[in-house]
C-alpha cells in the first residue's frame, strides 16, 4: 500500500475489425483501477470493464446492438483499495473516446476467397461471406446482411504467366469475369465501401491461383 | 469531506448471515465506485466487493458466490449480504467510496466463531 494520485487516461483509440470493437487506452495503471461507460448520444451511461486493470475492453456486445448509432465511451481512473489517497477529494478523474460509429469507421477485414469455377472461357469466383457479431433474431448476420450494396467487391486477376492485373467490381459475392482458354489465373479481392470517407477499403485476400485446390476447372 | 458510517458487524456462528450497511454523509455521485474491503489480523487490506453506479459488480476471489453487494444510489448507500460465513471470514469490515481518491469508513467488526 501507499499513496499516490491517480492520472487520468490518455490516447483512447478504438480498433474495430467487422464490427469486433475494442477501445484501448494508456498507461498501464500503477496503484489504479479502471472502468469504462459507453453510451450512444441519447443513452445512459452502461458500465464496461468494471474495476479492471486492462487497458483496453471490448465493446462489441455493446455497438453491435445498433452499428449506425454514434457511441462516446469514457475511461474512469480509480485509487487502487490498498491506496491511501493524497489527492483533492471529488469526482474521479475521466478521458473522453473519440465518437465512434461502426457502420461507418469499422475496419473491413481481409476477404477470402472461397472458390473459382471455370466453364470453358469464364470463371466464376465466389468470396467468403464473412459472419459478423452483429445479432438480429438471434442469427449472426453475415458482412453482405449488414452492409447490402454499400459493400462491393473488387476483384484483381491476372494470367500466372505475366504481371498485367485486370480487375471486376461486383456487389454481390460473386464475380464472373472472361479469361483467355488454356491459361492459368491468380486472383485476388479486396472489400470496399465506395460512399465511406474513411476505411473504405480493406487489405487484399491472399492470392489463389488456378491449378492449385480451390478452384474447379471444366472443360467445355 | 464525505464521512462513510459502518453498521450491521458482530457476532455469527460459522455457517451463519450478516448484513452490513454503509451510508454517506453527504451525496454520492453515480461516477463512483463504492464497496466494502476487509482486514484481517496480520494480513493486508484485501477487497470484498465493489459496486457502480449502475450496479455492476466485482468481488474478491475468496468471494466464491457467498456474498452480494447492492447499492442505493438515492440513499447513498451501500450493502453487503454475507452468507455461508466462516471463522476465516473474520475481520473488520471497511466501506469505501473511490472517485477521485479513497474515502473510508471507520471498520465495523465482523467476528464468525462458534
Known amino acids: 500500500s501507499g499513496t499516490t494520485n491517480t492520472v487520468a487516461a490518455y490516447n483512447l483509440t478504438w480498433k474495430s475489425t467487422n464490427f469486433k470493437t475494442i477501445l484501448e487506452w494508456e498507461p498501464k495503471p500503477v496503484n489504479q483501477v479502471y472502468t469504462v461507460q459507453i453510451s450512444t448520444k441519447s443513452g445512459d451511461w452502461k458500465s464496461k470493464c468494471f474495476y479492471t486493470t486492462d487497458t483496453e475492453c471490448d465493446l462489441t456486445d455493446e455497438i453491435v446492438k445498433d452499428v449506425k448509432q454514434t457511441y462516446l465511451a469514457r475511461v474512469f481512473s480509480y485509487p487502487a483499495g490498498n491506496v491511501e489517497s493524497t489527492g483533492s477529494a471529488g469526482e474521479p478523474l475521466y478521458e473522453n473516446s473519440p465518437e465512434f460509429t461502426p457502420y461507418l469507421e469499422t475496419n473491413l477485414g481481409q476477404p477470402t476467397i472461397q472458390s473459382f469455377e471455370q466453364v470453358g472461357t469464364k470463371v466464376n469466383v465466389t468470396v467468403e461471406d464473412e459472419r459478423t457479431l452483429v445479432r438480429r433474431n438471434n442469427t449472426f448476420l453475415s458482412l453482405r446482411d449488414v452492409f447490402g450494396k454499400d459493400l462491393i467487391y473488387t476483384l484483381y486477376y491476372w494470367k500466372s504467366s505475366s504481371s498485367g492485373k485486370k480487375t471486376a467490381k461486383t456487389n454481390t459475392n460473386e464475380f464472373l469475369i472472361d479469361v483467355d482458354k488454356g491459361e492459368n489465373y491468380c486472383f485476388s479481392v479486396q472489400a470496399v465501401i465506395p460512399s465511406r470517407t474513411v476505411n473504405r477499403k480493406s487489405t487484399d485476400s491472399p492470392v489463389e491461383c488456378m491449378g492449385q485446390e480451390k478452384g474447379e476447372f471444366r472443360e467445355i | 469531506a464525505v464521512q462513510l458510517v459502518e453498521s450491521g458487524g458482530g457476532l455469527v456462528q460459522p455457517g451463519g448471515s450478516l448484513s452490513l450497511s454503509c451510508a454517506a454523509s453527504?451525496?454520492?455521485?453515480?461516477?463512483?465506485?463504492m464497496g466494502w474491503y476487509r482486514r484481517s489480523p496480520g494480513k493486508e487490506r484485501e477487497l470484498v466487493a465493489v459496486?457502480?453506479?449502475?450496479?455492476?459488480?466485482h468481488y474478491g476471489d475468496f468471494v466464491k458466490g457467498r456474498f452480494a453487494i447492492s447499492r442505493d444510489n438515492v440513499k447513498n448507500a451501500v450493502y453487503l449480504k454475507m452468507n455461508f460465513l466462516t471463522p476465516e471470514d473474520t475481520a473488520v469490515y471497511y466501506c469505501?467510496?473511490?472517485?477521485?481518491?479513497?474515502?473510508w469508513g471507520q471498520g465495523t467488526q465482523v467476528t464468525v466463531s462458534s
Open positions: 459496486i457502480s453506479g449502475d450496479g455492476v459488480t
Open positions: 469505501n467510496a473511490a472517485g477521485r481518491r479513497n474515502h
Open positions: 453527504e451525496m454520492i455521485s453515480s461516477t463512483y465506485i
